[in-house]
């Protein structure tokens, strides 16, 4: 893991360079001021202690300054995400300075050696920032370090070593191996900047987690639970990206953090919102769609500064590509039955009808099981803005469409063989929009017919704004 001692150590001695290139002494880190959106433009290389390039290249001392820090590389070249990010930053912040930190020679090595070089690179960035601070009008408050993978921890070291406090660090899927569980001074952590926000897109609880699982910032956002990213499955990758191997799936999911950040820069009008939650499972159940007390935030560049005492883990669902925004809904369905039906695992689908559009048929993901005579909470999300919801169609899937469903049906039958007429009653559905925080209640279209069974459907119409019904003493008590 990275070496523990402070910025005063003999850092150059730590460099893990291939023997062949140790002869010529050159700075191992270069700073390229990207002076054009054109990725082919060579930009300007900044040199510590040399003010002329700053003037010649139009470095704006009063503007925001972004430092983009790449991660470990197998190819030794800048990957294509880099110029996408540079271009997006230039588009969003026209006057900003966009600096690419080139530490390719130190990153194009065995992963363990590259990890051991992160501290040295962080120190180089800190020295550059210290030098810039000597200039009139340059403020660390305007500095935003954006580090991808191993680069996120480099940013952490830079923030730790610099004299003063940088304004912001964004960690884009910070690297996991050799950093998971590490001491705060040996990885990205909240004390490395005034505001540290993190996107986690490739975390795995089994096997190797390329991205770090633990929260390391003031806010840690886990899109799609931080693991399986839509559009990155083997089938998707085979069809749409170069190569089409497991390696590409890994790359797709790990790099998704960068694209989510780019999306937040270029699709300002379509911000994605994340919601605070203790874990991914609770989020999948639809429990965590509150915006009260800073419990929700925009993701990526638009994230609002939150400096909590504790790490804040936040979750959201996304589309498979840009724009990534989806619309989240919490659905509370009180399911009751007149007979004891034993363990029952219905496969429910909903279709939402709105003033702008209608949703596709959406599955209600049952995270654990359906509780009878109780309120069940679900999360559904749509790719399009439906507008104001008007009605909901709830369907209980009939004939099994998969081996899993067939097994569910069989298991259900074996537990209750003498109960062929499986039937549940649902009188109303309560819906809350994550994006608008609006609460609505939908009542069964036919109050006399609230029963649903396999292969059947129920229709619900909006019957009031808000959740409390007239004559209702408590929202949790449902009378048949």
């Amino acid at each position: 893991s990275p070496t523990p001692f402070g910025p005063e150590g003999q850092l150059e001695d730590e460099l893990h360079k291939p023997k062949a290139i140790q002869t010529e002494v050159k700075p191992s880190v270069r700073f390229n001021l990207r002076t054009s959106k054109d990725p082919e433009h060579e930009g300007c290389y900044l040199s510590l202690g040399h003010s002329q390039p700053l003037e010649d290249c139009g470095f704006n001392m009063t503007a925001k300054t972004f430092f983009i820090i790449h991660g470990w590389t197998m190819s030794g070249i800048f990957e294509n995400w880099l110029h996408k990010l540079v271009s997006a930053l230039h588009t969003r912040e026209k006057d900003a300075n966009v600096v690419v930190v080139d530490w390719l020679p130190l990153a194009h090595q065995l992963y363990t050696d590259a990890v051991n070089n992160t501290r040295v690179v962080g120190h180089s960035i800190a020295r550059m920032l210290d030098w810039l601070q000597e200039k009139d009008d340059f403020s660390l408050e305007n500095v935003h370090l954006i580090g991808y993978s191993l680069g996120a921890h480099v940013a952490g070291y830079a923030g730790n070593f610099v004299k003063g406090t940088v304004g912001r660090i964004t960690g884009l899927d910070p690297a996991g191996p050799m950093f998971e569980g590490a001491d705060i001074h040996k990885r990205l952590s909240p004390d490395d900047a005034d505001f540290v926000d993190v996107l986690h897109t490739y975390t795995r609880s089994f096997g190797l987690s390329i991205g770090i699982q633990m929260p390391v910032g003031h806010i840690d956002i886990y899109p799609n639970g931080g693991d399986f990213q839509p559009g990155c499955g083997l089938n998707d990758v085979l069809g749409s990206m170069a190569y089409g191997t497991i390696t590409e799936v890994v790359k797709c999911e790990h790099e998704r953090a960068v694209h989510l950040f780019v999306d937040s820069l270029v699709n300002q009008d379509k911000p994605s919102f994340a919601f605070q939650c203790t874990d991914s499972n609770r989020f999948k159940k639809g429990i965590c769609l509150s915006c009260r007390k800073n419990r929700c935030n925009s993701i990526g560049y638009n994230a609002k500064k939150m400096r909590n005492k504790r790490n804040s883990k936040m979750y959201l669902k996304t589309r498979a590509g840009m724009p990534f925004r989806v619309y989240h809904y919490q659905m509370k369905i009180h399911v009751f039955s007149y007979k004891n039906m034993g363990e029952i695992e219905p496969t429910f689908y909903v279709t939402l009808y709105g003033t702008n559009a209608d949703s596709q048929t959406l599955p209600l993901e049952i995270v654990e099981r359906i509780e009878q005579n109780a309120t069940n909470t679900f999360l559904v999300y749509t790719e399009e803005d439906l507008g104001d919801l008007l009605k909901i169609q709830l369907t209980w899937e009939g004939a099994s469409q998969s081996w899993y469903n067939l097994w569910k049906e069989l298991r259900s039958y074996l537990s209750q063989p003498h109960n062929p007429g499986r039937e549940l009653n649902i009188r109303r559905i309560r819906v809350k929009s994550g994006e608008t925080q609006r609460k609505l209640t939908f009542c069964a279209e036919d109050p006399e017919n609230t029963s649903i069974s396999p292969g059947r459907e129920l229709w619900f119409r909006k019957c009031r704004d808000g959740w409390r019904m007239k004559n209702e003493t408590s929202p949790t008590v449902e009378l048949p």
């Epitope: 291939p18 062949a20 290139i21 010529e24 050159k26 270069r30 390229n32 990207r34 054109d38 990725p39 082919e40 433009h41 060579e42 930009g43 290389y45 197998m74 190819s75 030794g76 070249i77 800048f78 990957e79 294509n80 995400w81 880099l82 110029h83 996408k84 540079v86 690419v100 080139d102 390719l104 020679p105 194009h108 069809g239 749409s240 990206m241 170069a242 190569y243 089409g244 694209h259």
Partner: antibody
Framework: QIQLVQSGPELKKPGETVKISCKAS????????MNWVKQAPGKGLKWMGW????????TYADDFKGRFAFSLETSASTAYLQINNFKNEDTATYFC?????????????WGQGTALTASS | DIVLTQSPASLAVSLGQRATISCKAS??????????MNWYQQKPGQPPKLLIY???NLKSGIPARFSGSGSGTDFTLNIHPVEEEDAATYYC??????????FGGGTKLEIK
């Protein structure tokens, strides 16, 4: 203007070592990567690999690992290709070509080529 | 490695007509909306010359009669109207994130 000027043609005996040069001018040498491309007589182009002109770190295509070596003389803005234990199948024209580190990696300027021929 | 297959291997086109050269990749060379496919022209005794990069972008100084199109695995170079000086061999090349960067086998264009 931007130019890549390569050393002249050479006749080599099998087993010998040959080193060809590619001198860059008109741009900052260390700001662009340098590729090497082989073209056997009457055949197509084959990418051999590239060298980071700033760090000196070379990357070789699988078919060119072992007997081939890329190197630099940064002060002279020159890249070199060395072929050890020259073989008959090394008879070809070798091109150097630069690419932008920051862009889409296409080869925008090429050297005129150096013809290497095996003599028996 | 990504294999690029060019077709036809050679073609003869009358002056002023359209020449169409195809390049098929064994896997997609697309990345986030961009296609990492380039086209080069090579005349006998000369080095290759870049014509088109990122599938459809014309390099400055190259005549507008050259155009590129395609995405994913299928790409096309069009020359219209063909001129005498366009007689050459044309190569496609992919430059995706991870080398090796490969070339197609080449298409020899003859002017009738």
């Amino acid at each position: 203007q931007i130019q890549l000027v390569q050393s002249g043609p050479e006749l080599k005996k099998p087993g010998e070592t040959v080193k060809i040069s590619c001198k860059a001018s008109g741009y900052t040498f260390t700001n662009y990567g340098m590729n090497w491309v082989k073209q056997a007589p009457g055949k197509g182009l084959k990418w051999m690999g590239w060298i980071n002109t700033y760090s000196g770190v070379p990357t070789y295509a699988d078919d060119f690992k072992g007997r081939f070596a890329f190197s630099l003389e940064t002060s002279a803005s020159t890249a070199y290709l060395q072929i050890n234990n020259f073989k008959n199948e090394d008879t070809a024209t070798y091109f150097c070509a630069r690419f932008s580190y920051y862009g889409r990696h296409y080869f925008d300027y090429w050297g005129q080529g150096t013809a290497l021929t095996a003599s028996s | 490695d990504i294999v690029l297959t060019q077709s036809p291997a050679s073609l003869a086109v009358s002056l002023g007509q359209r020449a169409t050269i195809s390049c098929k990749a064994s896997q997609s060379v697309d990345y986030d909306g961009d296609s990492y496919m380039n086209w080069y022209q090579q005349k006998p005794g000369q080095p290759p010359k870049l014509l088109i990069y990122a599938a459809s972008n014309l390099k400055s100084g190259i005549p507008a009669r050259f155009s590129g199109s395609g995405s994913g695995t299928d790409f096309t170079l069009n020359i219209h109207p063909v001129e005498e000086e366009d007689a050459a061999t044309y190569y496609c090349q992919q430059t995706t994130d991870d080398p090796p960067w490969t070339f197609g086998g080449g298409t020899k264009l003859e002017i009738k």
